[in-house]
Structures are given as C-alpha cells and as structure tokens.
C-alpha cells in the first residue's frame, strides 16, 4: 500500500504541516524512504523547482512541518511524496484552504437566571481564542460553534456560529448535567478545528 497524504493543516496562517500514511508492503514497512518535496508557484522558473521538506521532525512521524519562514498565504503550494524517486501522491493548495485553528481554551460558565418554576435555567458560556491565533491584528478572524448535550445523550445540539467568545445557552434542565464544547474556524473558511476540552455544567437544584 503506497503512502497517501492524510491532511495538511495550518493552525494560524503562519505555519503548516502535512501528514501521510505509512507505506506498507506485505505487512512490512516499504524499503524505500518516503520523502516530501514542495514547490511554491511556477511562473518565473522554466522548470518547477522542487525542494525537500524543511523539517520531518517537529510535527511527528510521517509528517513535514513548514515554519513561518516557509509559509505565506499569498502563493500556491504543491507537495508530493516520493519513494525511490517515484511520485506516489501529490496535491496543491493555498495555506488559507488548510487553516484549522487549535481548540478554544479556558471554557467556563456562569448562571444567568433560573425560571420561576425552578425547572429551567439559562447560563452564559465563555472561552478564549486559541493562544496562537493572532486575532488582535485581524490576521485570524474566528467564528465559533458551541455544542452541548446532556451527559447521557449521544447527540450534540449545535448553536449557530458566532464571532464573540461568549454565548448564552437557554432552557437547560436544572436536574441534569450537561457537556459543553466549542470549536472554531476562520471566517469564510469551511474547515473547523478540533473541539475544546469538554466543560461540565451541573445546575444547582
């Protein structure tokens, strides 16, 4: 089985990494070393200048990491995997297409009010943007999606995406425990990042 790209991801538009599957040959790793080559646009060069991955270590096994010196959102990239000189997989993209922010952090909640009947309560959930997202300068404008559910349920309820880092959640049952999680994406992007750690909400009787 030949290696294949599984994912390229940029957490903050300033670096990115690409990952691929192991090469497997009859249950053993392929003898040919896997190399990643990349090229940035091909207008001036008469022939495409392919350069080898600058860092095979930082993003883990079967990966290539491009630090900020190798990353620009203003040019197209093409990458290819080679084994014994043969190309086994390839793809082209712009950095903005692979932006998937790190999870939001520091989730917490406060009680807003309890219904007159004492059956339902409203809460305010707050969080912080991923630390590496440069949101102050507008380089990363993030949209957040909050999901919640009762602890014993399997289906998450999704709230509409918002730009703020806090949102009220209405009509929770006071005798239940809830799980809340938040993820983000760059505005106008299609790719959400991973969810935050789950916040557990237990409403007082």
């Amino acid at each position: 089985k030949e290696p294949k790209f599984t994912k390229c991801r940029s957490p903050e538009r300033e670096t990115f990494s690409c990952h691929w599957t192991d090469a497997v040959h009859h249950g053993l790793k392929s003898l040919g070393p896997i190399q990643l080559f990349y090229t940035r646009r091909n207008i001036q060069e008469q022939t495409q200048e392919w350069k080898e991955c600058p860092d095979y270590v930082s993003a883990g096994e079967n990966s290539c990491y491009f630090n900020s010196s190798f990353t620009s959102v203003w040019i197209p990239y093409c990458i290819k995997l080679t084994s014994n000189g043969d190309t086994v997989d390839g793809k082209c993209f712009s950095v903005d297409e692979i932006v998937q922010p790190d999870p939001p952090i520091a989730l917490n909640w406060t009680l807003l009010n309890v219904s007159l009947t004492g059956i339902h309560a409203d809460i305010q959930v707050r969080w912080e943007a991923p630390p590496n997202a440069d949101i102050q300068k507008g380089w990363m404008v993030l949209e957040y999606e909050l999901q919640y559910k009762e602890v014993n349920e399997t289906k998450w309820k999704m709230m509409d995406p918002i730009l703020s880092t806090s949102v009220p959640v209405y009509s929770l049952k006071v005798d239940k425990e809830y799980e809340v999680r938040v993820r983000s994406k760059r505005r106008n992007s299609r790719n959400y990042g991973e969810f935050s750690e789950v916040l557990y909400v237990t409403l007082p009787q």
Epitope: E14, R40, R41, I43, Q44, S68, S69, F70, T71, S72, W74, I75, P76, C92, F93, S94, D96, E97, K137, W139
Partner: antibody, heavy 115, light 108 residues
Framework: EVQLVESGGGLVKPGGSLRLSCAAS????????MDWVRQAPGKGLEWVAE??????????YYAESVKGRFTISRDDSKNTLYLQMNSLKTEDTAVYYC??????WGQGTLVTVSS | EIVLTQSPGTLSLSPGERATLSCTAT???????LNWYQQKPGQAPRLLIY???NLASGIPDRFSGSGSGTDFTLTISRLEPEDFAVYYC?????????FGGGTKVEIK
Amino acid sequence: EVQLVESGGGLVKPGGSLRLSCAASGFTFSDAWMDWVRQAPGKGLEWVAEIRSKANYHATYYAESVKGRFTISRDDSKNTLYLQMNSLKTEDTAVYYCTLIRDYWGQGTLVTVSS
Amino acid sequence: EIVLTQSPGTLSLSPGERATLSCTATSSVSSSYLNWYQQKPGQAPRLLIYSTSNLASGIPDRFSGSGSGTDFTLTISRLEPEDFAVYYCHQYHRSTPTFGGGTKVEIK
C-alpha cells in the same frame, strides 16, 4: 509570452462606478492567481485585490482601503479579469495594473475620480 | 501590515558606477517572499528579482539581491544607461502584500 491588456479606465465623478477589464493570454488563465495593483500619480505601488483559481475556490482578497467598494472577479471562459469599482473617491485616482500574481504586469489603465 | 522603507529616496550616480539600494521592513520577512521591481517612466513595473536573490527571466546578471530578516539590498554592479529608473521592493510574506516607497536612480 504572457500578455495582459487592461481597459475600462476613464474619468468618473466621486461616488460613481467603473468596471475595469484585463484580457489575458500566453498562459493558462484558469490556473492563475490574478491581482490588481494601483499607482497614484507620482506615487508608489499599492496592492488592491487578488482572485485565486477555480482550484482555489476563486477566493478573493482586498486591501482595507477598497474593501466593500471594489469587487474582483474573473471569467475563465473569456480569459478576462475584472475589477468593479463602486463608491469611488478622489483618492482612488491611479493607474490600475492587472498582474499575474504580481510577476507579470499589464501596461495599466488610468482611472481619474474628479468632480 | 508590514511597512517597507526604501533608502535612499533618490540615488544620483553615473553610468558604470555601482548602485546599492536598501529596503527595510518593520518586521521580519522570509527571504522567499521578497521581490524587487524596476519601473521606467510611462511603463509598468517589471519583476527584476524574486525570493530576495533570484534573477527573473531576461534580467542581466549585473543585478543582484541579498538580505534576510528586516534588511534587504538590491545591487547593480555597473550602471548601464537603461538602468536609470525607479526600483521598488515588495513583500508577500505576512499581512497583505506591500511595496516600498521606491528609490529613484538618476543620472548624475
């Protein structure tokens, strides 16, 4: 040989609109990222907008100074790039260059915004 | 955004002399994403050097580029009459693409 030919410039009153066109040849236009860059009389160069290829979802980007007023678009079947300019201001007066990812440039078309 | 400051604003030299043009960025720019352009009166800019030090096609080797971080240099080893023009540096690394204010190389 890469060729970029702009047209559509002219004199327009403040608040008015204008649409610039750029006819491209000598390269695979549908694969190209295209930009508009402008130059006010006697001044330096200012990047205005970019549109990417279909493979890159025709994503568009704008300078803050034109965001919400200018729209970059393309017609790959006609090998043509466009810049729709609305709510024009006197400070938009400039020669507008069509560029292939800022590597190859057309000769430019002059836009004058004046009452 | 990254602001590029070019110096000097004007450089007065004679043909055959060496020209050294400077471009300073307000924050670090990867050498892969810095270009130089030449513009003659009434003409469009022309790409001279891409990625700090690579000559664009058809550009004579009397032009060279160097630098890293925040400081970049365009050098013309021996000025020819056709080299008198305005030169712009350009970065497309971070923020939106920006250009320097230009250096005019004029005949002394």
